[in-house]
């Protein structure tokens, strides 16, 4: 016996399709050898129409495909379009040749069965509603009217104009006429499930003289939309459920063995294997709305369904729209680390990808919030101003061209804690999740800033020192002035950088920024920061603040970023003069600077600026300096 | 509550015929698939046919290997019922045969896993 299994005779009518699943034994091979579907002639030759490797015959051209789904075992055949020519054998099989392991299947097709020819069609969906146009003679206005539901032996009432109502229809059927008009009345029917599909007869009247017509009623399950998406990249769930469900709660579920379960609804459920990268946006008032999931990973693949009832939970009789998505595991999207760590105090750069083919796509981040019906309120973006709360520790560093951008978040708190996108207005895609997780800091900083108290006098001087440990000795150090559009990179002269050393003190490797002469400009938030090439590492920042030279003035320290820095040893530095004053930018709002939120974010408009980079947006001119210190014991 | 009633069993000559019915009730019934499966004494129970259908006109049909021609599955005009016309009988028929049905989407129709509802079984007994 053929160890292939599959439905020995499959039987179906012209126009309609058929999904012919064959089923293969678990081994490796198995799953990736050809598979195949082939008729049998009688010569005994089985021609192939269909193969796993995109062999097509002409006859399937366009109505026909093989998908393997290996996790199962098993392999689909759909064919549509079916006409009495597909009438045969067949067989499915696996191997190189169609003489390898198969299973024979018999198909036939069939004319589509007759009905009284003055049978009315009606063609509805699940959950919605149907009305039924029945015609009568004007004597039959006075008499009783009907409708009934054919079964094998007798004809079932649903309703007629008594008010009689069949249990199953109780609240779902409507008997009525409209107006004045005496000759046709109409019954409704909602909520409509497969079980109301079928032949039914209206009718006015009673004996010989009665007004009867047929009606064929088909309720259709809706065919899944098939949704191919990269692991890693995200998927928008366009649901459209019509006007009718516009004020229902409404929800996203995935189909299991027995039900649907619930991932995302508008009253607040939210399944936890979502968490942070699920969104769902009522879209307008007419019952549509979208789902949005990022991060996709492999057991998102699934059959899945949406839906409005006013539980926000699957009902029988409620419209519905379904999806089959298939998650392709040979990704385009760089797989990077979904969950990043800092500690309170320090810093983290997070790497964004994005497609490299759209380096002047505007780039995002956000973050997801579940509150509701989740949002992702935009924090920083090329041309989006970091929001204030994140003033003087929030930067984004566009690297045109290499597919990455990279997101620097400083002076962490364990309220940073959460679910963050990266996401760009170009390839919808490519939106990506982290989770940023932050720890009570154990030991002291790796980079640490001095003098604690910077507060620069104008017209002087000033100049701060960034140490950083012999772990950081090989990578380039930079100091950098935030703006709310970027910090910029200062130019930096990094002397004894490259002589090699016998040993590195801990005590003295430092990287320093002065200041001369200071102006009024030059108060705010600087970084400094540890980079090697394109991929940066921690920062540090400081706030300086510049007044006007008092007698005996007293500095007050403006945040608490500056009581966190420690106070370091004595160091020679070396100094470099800045003499350029800072270009005043003006500031640019962003494509969310009204609603800055990424909701619709399926929808976003296509910019039309050209991007600008957020790590050169400044203008400034400042330099800054480093000194190695090499003792040798 | 879904219920699954079989019927139809019974004595029979080897080479004689029966036929087994399965009434479905309940009305959360709405499965569009019904499997038979049969259990000897001392014996695994063991996959005898399936049949789903796809809208009105379109069927798929299921055999166990053993079935070889004689055994046909079909659904009654009445959605809730499904027969198993057994031909050529032979005492290794005889056992205790089972209707069962899934709630919804099913993997593979051989394995038991794949239903969740199931009748209580009726007797067939094949004398030589």
């Known amino acids: 016996k053929s160890p292939i299994f599959g439905p020995q005779e499959v039987s179906s009518i012209e126009g309609d399709s058929v999904s012919i699943t064959c089923y293969y034994p678990d081994t490796s091979v198995n799953r990736h050898t050809r598979k195949y579907w082939c008729r049998q002639g009688a010569s005994g030759m089985c021609t192939t129409l269909i193969s796993s490797n995109g062999y097509l015959s002409k006859e399937y051209s366009g109505r026909a495909n093989l998908i393997n789904f290996p996790e199962n075992n098993t392999f689909v055949i759909n064919i549509e379009q079916l006409t009495q020519d597909d009438t045969g054998s067949y067989k499915c099989g696996l191997g190189t040749s169609n003489r390898g392991l198969s299973f024979d299947v018999s198909l036939e097709v069939s004319q589509v069965p007759e009905l009284p020819s003055d049978t009315h069609v009606y063609t509805k969906d699940i959950g919605r509603n149907v009305t039924i146009e029945c015609p009568f003679k004007r004597e039959n206005a006075p008499s009783k009217k009907s409708l009934c539901k054919k079964t094998n032996q007798s004809c079932e009432l649903v309703i007629d104009s008594t008010e009689k109502v069949n249990p199953s229809y109780i609240g779902r059927a409507k008997l009525f006429m409209k107006g004045t008009d005496l000759t046709v009345f109409y019954v409704n029917i909602s909520h409509l499930t497969h079980n109301d599909a079928g032949l039914y007869i209206c009718q006015a009247g009673e004996g010989p003289s009665a007004d009867k017509k047929n009606v064929d009623l088909q309720v259709l399950a809706p065919e899944p939309e098939l949704l191919y998406k990269d692991l890693r990249s995200s998927v928008t769930f366009e649901c459209d459920l019509g006007r009718e469900v516009a004020n229902e709660a409404k929800y996203l579920c995935r189909m299991n063995k027995e039900t649907c379960d619930v991932i995302i609804n508008t009253l607040g459920k939210r399944d936890p294997d979502f968490e942070g990268r699920i969104l769902i946006t009522p879209k307008d008032d007419n019952g549509r709305f979208s789902v949005l999931i990022t991060g996709l990973r492999k057991e998102d693949a699934g059959h899945y369904q949406c839906g409005a009832h006013s539980s926000g939970l699957p009902q029988e009789g409620w419209p519905i729209q379904t999806w089959q998505l298939f998650v392709n595991e040979e990704s385009t999207i760089p797989n990077r680390r979904s969950v990043v760590k800092g500690v309170t105090g320090g810093s983290v750069a997070i790497a964004c990808p994005y497609n490299p083919k759209e380096s002047s796509s505007l780039k995002y981040w956000c973050r997801w919030e579940g509150d509701g019906n989740g949002h992702c309120p935009v924090l920083v973006g090329t041309q989006a101003q970091v929001q204030e709360e994140y003033e003087g520790r929030l930067a984004l560093f566009d690297q045109p061209g290499n597919g990455t951008y990279t997101v620097i978040l400083n002076q962490l708190t364990t309220e940073d804690a959460g679910f963050y996108w990266c996401l760009t207005n170009g390839d919808s895609r490519w939106r990506t999740t982290i989770e940023l997780q932050v720890a009570e800091a154990t030991r002291e900083p790796n980079l640490e800033v001095t003098p604690q108290n910077a507060t620069a006098v104008l017209g002087e001087t000033f100049t701060v020192s960034c140490h950083y440990p012999c772990k950081f000795y090989s990578q380039e150090k930079y100091w950098c002035k935030w703006s709310n559009k970027g910090c910029h990179i200062l130019p930096s002269h990094d002397e004894g950088a490259r002589q090699s050393s016998v040993s590195c003190d801990q005590s003295s490797q430092l990287v320093s920024m002065t200041l001369n002469p200071v102006s009024k400009e030059d108060e705010g938030w600087y970084w400094c920061g540890v980079k090697q090439g394109q991929t940066y590492g921690e920062t540090t920042a400081i706030y300086i603040a510049v007044e006007e030279r008092t007698r005996g003035s007293s500095h007050v320290n403006p945040t608490d970023a500056n009581a966190r820095a420690k106070v370091a040893l004595e160091e020679e530095v070396v100094d470099s003069s800045i003499s350029e004053k800072e270009n005043k930018a003006i500031p640019n709002p962003g494509p969310f600077a009204n609603e800055r939120e990424i909701q619709n974010v399926g929808d976003q408009a296509q910019e039309n600026r050209a991007s600008g980079d957020a790590g050169s947006a400044d203008g400034q001119s400042r330099s800054s300096s480093s000194k190695h210190h090499h003792h040798h014991h | 509550e879904v219920q699954l009633v079989e019927s139809g069993g019974g004595l029979v000559q080897a080479g004689g015929s029966l036929r087994l019915s399965c009434a479905a009730s309940?009305?959360?019934?709405?499965?569009?698939?019904v499997g038979w499966f049969r259990q000897a004494p001392g014996k695994e129970r063991e996959f005898v046919a399936h049949?789903?259908?796809?809208?009105?006109?379109?069927?798929?049909?299921y055999y166990g290997d053993f079935v070889k021609g004689r055994f046909t599955i079909s659904r009654g005009t009445a959605k809730n019922t499904v027969y198993l016309q057994m031909n050529s009988l032979k005492p290794e028929d005889t056992a205790v045969y089972y209707c069962?049905?899934?709630?919804?989407?099913?993997?593979?129709?051989?394995?038991?896993?794949?239903?969740?509802?199931w009748g209580q079984g009726t007797l067939v007994t094949v004398s030589s």
């Open positions: 309940g009305r959360t019934f709405s499965s569009d698939a």
């Open positions: 049949i789903h259908w796809s809208g009105d006109f379109t069927t798929y049909y």
């Open positions: 069962a049905a899934p709630k919804g989407a099913i993997g593979d129709p051989r394995s038991t896993r794949e239903y969740d509802y």
